[in-house]
């Protein structure tokens, strides 16, 4: 995995200033979910990683931003709209929906730091919330009251 | 969320040293549902948050460490060994297992920084991988070949 060697300003800068500026503005994912182009993947395997054995199977899509920490995030993408039957592992069961589990993840964006007179003094990290989908979960549909 | 105002050492330290090594893994939900204290919670609700509507329902347990970033992590705990029937929402279906989705999450521990002569110069962040469970997923059991 990649890393940044330092979150600190350039050599010699007064490091007592607040380098991590914290805010809580959610940022949407860069790549919206696209329908899966491979219909044959809507099945629950009897082997392999958990995301392929799930009856709400999913794949991961890479989202890379070189000015963000983490630089690489992965968004889950559901392979089926409904859950796969436990019996067959292939047919869909319309009684269950395959839903994304979302999470607002804390990320840090690298921004230029500015000194007392507005001069550029290294980089600061700005905290943001960034929405990622972690997995697909088989749920009972909501009953509207 | 509390925060540390700076991830850098105290004034005057050479900040060109490598303070942070960053990895690229997702973080579990910030605001999970509170743990359900009732044993009848091994059921899939038709309402409420995703973790209670799932046929592999789970609760979250808080893990707080004030010398770690993030300070609060949440671990998913499965409420049923098997998946809940989509038909009834309560009876378990032994054809499916409720399995934890694990992730090695990058966290940072606050450690004292030491200057050239071993003097304490502020705090540095030490990167570690920390295993968290994100959710419970209904899967087909592995077939042993």
């Amino acid at each position: 995995y990649s890393h940044w060697p330092s979150c600190c300003p350039s050599k010699g800068q007064d490091t007592s200033e607040e380098l991590l500026r914290w805010s809580t503005v959610p940022v949407p994912p860069l790549e919206p979910a696209r329908p899966n182009r491979h219909p044959e993947s809507c099945r629950a395997s009897e082997d392999g990683p958990l995301n392929s054995r799930a009856i709400s199977p999913w794949r991961y899509e890479l989202d890379r931003d070189l000015n963000r920490l983490p630089q690489d995030l992965y968004h889950a993408r559901c392979l089926c709209p409904h859950c796969v039957s436990l019996q067959t592992g292939s047919h869909m069961d319309p009684r269950g929906n395959s839903e994304l589990l979302y999470h607002n993840q804390t990320v840090f964006y690298r921004r230029p730091c500015h000194g007392e007179k507005g001069t550029h003094k290294g980089y600061c990290l700005e905290r943001r919330l960034y929405r990622v989908s972690l997995a697909c979960v088989c749920v009972r549909p909501r009953v509207m009251g | 969320y509390s925060h540390w105002p700076s991830c850098c050492p105290s004034k005057g330290q050479d900040t060109s040293e490598e303070l942070l090594r960053w990895s690229t893994v997702p973080v579990p939900p910030l605001e999970p549902a509170r743990p359900n204290r009732h044993p009848e919670s091994c059921r899939a609700s038709e309402d409420g948050p995703l973790n209670s509507r799932a046929i592999s329902p789970w609760r979250y347990e808080l893990d707080r460490d004030l010398n770690r970033l993030p300070q609060d992590l949440y671990h998913a705990r499965c409420l049923c060994p098997h998946c809940v029937s989509l038909q009834t929402g309560s009876h378990m279906d032994p054809r499916g297992n409720s399995e934890l989705l694990y992730h090695n999450q990058t966290v940072f521990y606050r450690r004292p920084c030491h200057g050239e002569k071993g003097t304490h110069k502020g705090y540095c962040l030490e990167r570690r991988l920390y295993r968290v469970s994100l959710a419970c997923v209904c899967v087909r059991p592995r077939v042993m070949g």
């Epitope: 995995y1 990649s2 890393h3 940044w4 060697p5 990683p49 995301n51 392929s52 794949r59 991961y60 899509e61 890479l62 890379r64 070189l66 630089q71 690489d72 992965y74 | 960053w22």
Partner: antibody, heavy 121, light 107 residues
Framework: EVQLVESGAEVKKPGASVKVSCKAS????????MNWVRQAPGQRLEWMGL????????SYNQNFKGRVTLTVDTSASTAYLELNSLRSEDTGVYYC???????????????WGQGTLVTVS | DIQMTQSPSSLSASVGDRVTITCSAS??????LNWYQQKPGKVPKLLIY???SLHSGVPSRFSGSGSGTDFTLTISSLQPEDVATYYC?????????FGQGTKLEIK
């Protein structure tokens, strides 16, 4: 010693599919993303996509309009490229290439397979 | 997609010459640029990463510079074994894109 060994040359009819394999050795397969790059005769290198063996995470070049599927078999330390709906312009050499990183500055393809020639005619 | 344009497309130089190849990006890519060398009939090899960092085992006669949209690969003293096609590649955004290549020959 890091090595990427690709499968042999293929000749395919238009409309068919091809699946190329790339067996890795000499490093931790799950620790590095794998890129796939195509070189048509006399043309520039063209990036097709990458896959992270750790979680199967992918990024595709949308210019291939969904015809590309990347997969891995971590137990065999092997990456696969599948290209379907083949046409004559898909003729070329297909390379797998490991993506290394050094710091936040660096994503680069440091080891390449020997290439697999795919001919569509 | 970010377009990468190299110039010249081909060049011929004598052993010992200083050779310069340029690469231009259609938009700013900071310093997120790699250079690859592909000898005739061979596989591409990483030469320089992050604009100016020499990959391990690459002779010091190779160097890179630039930032933003304009980049340069320089060979300070051309050697016979440097006959190859050289490609630049940006990695700030997906899809990664390569230049069309510069074919270098010995006079």
């Amino acid at each position: 010693e890091v090595q990427l060994v690709e499968s042999g040359a293929e000749v395919k009819k238009p409309g068919a599919s091809v699946k190329v394999s790339c067996k890795a050795s000499g490093y931790s397969f799950s620790g590095y993303t794998m890129n796939w790059v195509r070189q048509a005769p006399g043309q520039r290198l063209e990036w097709m996509g990458l896959i992270n063996p750790y979680n199967g995470g992918t990024s595709y070049n949308q210019n291939f309009k969904g015809r590309v599927t990347l997969t891995v078999d971590t137990s065999a330390s092997t990456a696969y490229l599948e290209l379907n709906s083949l046409r004559s312009e898909d003729t070329g050499v297909y390379y797998c290439a490991r993506e290394d990183f050094d710091s936040w500055t660096y994503f680069a393809m440091d080891y390449w397979g020997q290439g697999t020639l795919v001919t569509v005619s | 997609d970010i377009q990468m344009t190299q110039s010249p497309s081909s060049l011929s130089a004598s052993v010992g010459d200083r050779v310069t190849i340029t690469c231009s990006a259609s938009q700013g890519i900071n310093e997120y640029l790699n250079w690859y060398q592909q000898k005739p009939g061979k596989v591409p090899k990483l030469l320089i990463y992050y604009t100016s960092s020499l990959h391990s085992g690459v002779p010091s006669r190779f160097s890179g510079s630039g930032s933003g949209t304009d980049f340069t690969l320089t060979i300070s003293s051309l050697q016979p074994e440097d006959v190859a096609t050289y490609y630049c590649q940006q990695y700030i955004n997906f899809p990664y894109t390569f230049g069309q290549g510069t074919k270098l020959e010995i006079k």
